[in-house]
Interface confidence: medium
Amino acid sequence: FERTRSLQDPCSNCPAGTFCDNNRNQICSPCPPNSFSSAGGQRTCDICRQCKGVFRTRKECSSTSNAECDCTPGFHCLGAGCSMCEQDCKQGQELTKKGCKDCCFGTFNDQKRGICRPWTNCSLDGKSVLVNGTKERDVVCGPSPADLSPGASSVTPPAPAREPGHSPQ
C-alpha cells in the first residue's frame, strides 16, 4: 500500500533543483536564490552554505548542489567538508590558544599545521644520533654505537634508487 501511495505522490516527480510547492497545488517550483535541492521529491530547498569570513568559495552553490568552501591564504581546512579553518604557523611552531608558538626544546614540527612532536629517541632502537634535531626537523638516527668500530664509516650509503613498478636491473 505504501509503495502504491508513493508512486502516486506528485512530489516524487519533482527533480533535483526544484521543490514540491504545497502552496501551489504541489507544483514543482524552482529552488529560490541561495538555496538548493540535491535530490528529487523534496518538499523544501535547503539554504546554501555561505563561505564568509575566513572561508572562501571553492565551488558556488547551484540549484542542485551546496556551496563548497576552503580557507583564505594563511589558513588550512579542518574537519569534514572544510567545516573549520585553522591558522597556519611556520615550520618549527604550533598553534596554541595564544597564537603560534615555537616548539619547545626536544620537539619539532616540519609542517605549517599540527602540533610539535618529540624528537625520535634513537637509543630505544639501539641507535645513536647521527644528526641533531631542530625545531623544524626530527633527529636522524644512525647505526648503534657498537657498530661504529674505529675506521668504520658512520654514514651508510643510500640504497640504489628504484622507481615504483620497475624491477632492479
Epitope: 546554501c48 564568509k52 569570513g53 575566513v54 567545516s83 573549520m84
Partner: antibody, heavy 124, light 106 residues
Framework: EVQLVESGGGLVQPGGSLRLSCAAS??????????VAWIRQAPGKGLEWVSS????????YYADSVKGRFTISRDNSKNTLYLQLNSLRAEDTAVYYC???????????????WGQGTLVTVSS | DIQLTQSPSSLSASVGDRVTITCRAS??????LAWYQQKPGKAPKLLIY???NRATGIPSRFSGSGSGTDFTLTISSLQPEDFATYYC????????FGQGTKVEIK
C-alpha cells in the same frame, strides 16, 4: 586585551540618520579571518544580527531588515568600525553592539568579544 | 533565512539543578552553532562555539552537544551566577539567533 567600545547612539526622529562607531583595540580589524559585526537588541527583546564586514577582503553582509538603509564600513588606520543608519524607523530602536567574529584559529562564525552597546532611540 | 527555535522560552530552577536548553534549526547547520549567556544590562558572553567547544574561561559545568538540526546546552549543576538568558546562534548562512531562554530562580 581585546576591547570594543561603541559610541554615537542617541535620540533621532523617524526618517533621520545616525552614525555609530566602534573603536577596537587588542586586534586589527583588517586581519584575515577576523570579521566584525553589529548586533542589536530591542528593549526587552532578543538579539538580532544586523551587519558584518570580513577581515581581509572587507566583504559586507546585511540582514534583510536593514538592507539599503544601513551601511557598515571601517577605517583601518583608526582601527574603528562604523555603522551608518539612514531612513530610521521606530522598530530600529535598540541597543547596538559591535562584536568580533570568532577568532583566527577557527571558523569565525560566532562572536567572542562584545562591546558594552550604545542605545539608539527612534521617536518623534 | 535559517530559523532557530529555542525551548523552553523560560524555566525555573534551583541552585544545583541540571538544566537543559534545546535549539532546533530549520535545516542542518553543523557545526556552526554557538551559545551565549546574557545578564540584564550587559552584553552577551560566548559560552560554546562550534556546537561543543567551550570558550576560554567558561566553567566545565557548561557543555554543548548536538549536530545537524538539534543542539543542546547543558548546565550540569546550576550556580547562583547562572541565572540569566541564554541564546543560540547559527553561522552556517549569514547569522541568526534563537529567541532566548530565560533561566529564573524557583
Amino acid at each position: 586585551e581585546v576591547q570594543l567600545v561603541e559610541s554615537g547612539g542617541g535620540l533621532v526622529q523617524p526618517g533621520g540618520s545616525l552614525r555609530l562607531s566602534c573603536a577596537a583595540s587588542g586586534f586589527s580589524l583588517s586581519t584575515s579571518g577576523v570579521g566584525v559585526a553589529w548586533i542589536r537588541q530591542a528593549p526587552g527583546k532578543g538579539l538580532e544580527w544586523v551587519s558584518s564586514i570580513s577581515g581581509a577582503g572587507g566583504t559586507t553582509y546585511y540582514a534583510d531588515s536593514v538592507k539599503g538603509r544601513f551601511t557598515i564600513s571601517r577605517d583601518n588606520s583608526k582601527n574603528t568600525l562604523y555603522l551608518q543608519l539612514n531612513s530610521l524607523r521606530a522598530e530600529d530602536t535598540a541597543v547596538y553592539y559591535c562584536a568580533r567574529g570568532g577568532s583566527t584559529a577557527v571558523t569565525g562564525d560566532w562572536f567572542d568579544y562584545w562591546g558594552q552597546g550604545t542605545l539608539v532611540t527612534v521617536s518623534s | 533565512d535559517i530559523q532557530l527555535t529555542q525551548s523552553p522560552s523560560s524555566l525555573s530552577a534551583s541552585v544545583g539543578d541540571r538544566v537543559t536548553i534545546t535549539c532546533r534549526a530549520s535545516q542542518g547547520i553543523s557545526p556552526y552553532l554557538a551559545w551565549y549567556q546574557q545578564k540584564p544590562g550587559k552584553a552577551p558572553k560566548l559560552l560554546i562555539y562550534d556546537a561543543s567547544n567551550r570558550a576560554t574561561g567558561i566553567p566545565s559545568r557548561f557543555s554543548g552537544s548536538g549536530s545537524g538540526t538539534d543542539f543542546t546546552l547543558t548546565i550540569s549543576s546550576l550556580q547562583p551566577e547562572d541565572f540569566a538568558t541564554y541564546y543560540c546562534q547559527q553561522g552556517y548562512s549569514l547569522w541568526t539567533f534563537g529567541q532566548g531562554t530565560k533561566v529564573e530562580i524557583k
